[in-house]
Structures are given as C-alpha cells and as structure tokens.
Amino acid sequence: APVPPGEDSKDVAAPHRQPLTSSERIDKQIRYILDGISALRKETCNKSNMCESSKEALAENNLNLPKMAEKDGCFQSGFNEETCLVKIITGLLEFEVYLEYLQNRFESSEEQARAVQMSTKVLIQFLQKKAKNLDAITTPDPTTNASLLTKLQAQNQWLQDMTTHLILRSFKEFLQSSLRALRQM
C-alpha cells in the first residue's frame, strides 16, 4: 500500500519545509485516496470485463451511492461553500458502509482497500474541523448500515463484482468533484 500523506520520503528529506496548511493536507489526502481507488479499480477491471460492460449488463442500479447534484452547491454555477462542505462530509459518511463492503473483496490489493477505508476516515476528520455547521451533517444509522451490508454480501458473485465496480467508480467521481470544489474554498 502507498505511504499515507506526510510520511513519504520527500517529507523526511525536507525537514525545514513549511508545514502543510489545512487545505493542502485535505487536498493531499484526497489525491492519496484517489491513487488507492485507481489501484483497486485496476484489480477489479483485470479480473473481469465489468468495467467495459457495466452499461450493457445492467438495466437498473438501485445502489444509493452518494452523488453530487446542482443543489449541493459544489459546482461552479451556484457554488456555496458551506452547503458544499456539508454535502462532501455527509457523502463521505454515507460511503463508509460501502468502503466496509469493499474489505475482503480484493485478493492482491487487500491492504490497499484497508488504506482507502482508513484514509477516508482521516479525511472526514480533517473536513469536520473545517466545517462551521456540523449540526447540518447527518450521520447514517448504524442499524440501517448493518442491514445494507448484509444484503450486499448476500448477492451472488457476479452481482458482488458489479457492486464493487460501481462503488469504486462512484467514489472516484465523488472525490474528484469534492477535490475541485475544495480548491475553490
């Protein structure tokens, strides 16, 4: 697994460098998670043809994966810093159950899957420190999440592979949108 942000050899070699600002740390954390997702997607796509054929193979997708919409204030048009930050944190909290599902879904990238999960928890903490309106952030219900996890794990092999692909693709898109938005803040 890649080394978490702040622990790479460049940091060790440059002890006199200015410490990262909160925004820089968040930016770096997201890019680190995106690298991890990239590695996981590589394994998923190599294992099956899910990545090319998901459009034709699926008629309907009812996985309620977080997605950015106009009303969330994260796009350039209608940008709203506070609304957007709440959406990013809420979305990441909602993704956590899906990241838990990804554990044990990888053979050669098991550590990578764990790193993505743990780094996301750290990212949420960074963002919560940045947010002024923490009351607006709704935390998913643990009982609902446990039931969702059980249902996801009960699917057959093909559906689980497809679910894995869809989670990684959506999480990547969500993080990319978050990164663009956070750079405007």
Partner: nanobody, 125 residues
Framework: QVKLEESGGGLVQAGGSLRLSCASS????????MGWFRQTPGKEREFVST????????YYADSVKGRFTISRDNAKNTVYLQMNSLKPEDTAVYYC??????????????????WGQGTQVTVSS
C-alpha cells in the same frame, strides 16, 4: 431455495401470439428481480426481458421491443411474458430466471441465481 417452473410454450405460426408463465415456489417472490432468457441450439443464452421487484420498471432486448411484454403478479408468485407478432427467429427454449440481488437489475445470466427448466417455443413460417 426457489423453484421456477415455466409453462405456455408451444408451436405457433408466424404473426401469432403466446403467453409464457413462470411460477415460483419461493415465499419471497416479490424481493426477486425476474427475467426471461432464450437459447437456440449451439448459441449462447440470450437476454429477452427483465422486470424489477415491484413491476414498475421493465426492460427488453432490442429484438423483442414492441412485440413482447413482461409482467408480474406478486400475489400469485408468477411472472409472465406476452409474445405477440412472433417471428421464426423467436424459436428457442425460453427460460425464466430470478435474481436475489437487492439492488441491481441485471441483463446478463450471471446476475441471476435461480433458473427454470425452460419451455420450447417454435414459430413456423
């Protein structure tokens, strides 16, 4: 364990109609996505149609769109395939399938968990 049993197949002239039924023994029928597939000798199993849990969303292969209609009756644990304007190329063994996945509606056989034995449909010209 879910048992699926198709009926309604037979020999029909081109332009004619048939209605296939698939009865399920499972008590949780309404939680399954139901689909119809067909297969001709020496060819791969082909997707025909699928219907979501509630019956609100229906999907068809391009080759049958506008001619075939899928429906389900959750009270009777049965899914139907109404086939109109039949063509000789519709000749195949028709299989009913159930997918227990609670989130995705697949168009490929690997996404389905349970299969019926199949019913022969022959369309003569």
């Amino acid at each position: 364990q879910v048992k699926l049993e198709e009926s309604g197949g037979g020999l029909v002239q081109a332009g004619g109609s048939l209605r296939l039924s698939c009865a399920s023994s499972g008590r949780t029928f309404s939680s399954y996505v139901m689909g119809w597939f067909r297969q001709t000798p020496g060819k791969e199993r082909e997707f025909v149609s699928t219907i979501n849990w509630s019956g609100s969303n229906k999907y068809y292969a391009d080759s049958v769109k506008g001619r075939f209609t899928i429906s389900r009756d959750n009270a009777k644990n049965t899914v139907y395939l109404q086939m109109n304007s039949l063509k000789p190329e519709d000749t195949a063994v028709y299989y009913c399938a159930a997918s227990a996945g609670g989130f995705l509606v697949p168009r490929v056989g690997q996404g389905y968990d349970y299969w019926g034995q199949g019913t022969q449909v022959t369309v003569s010209s």
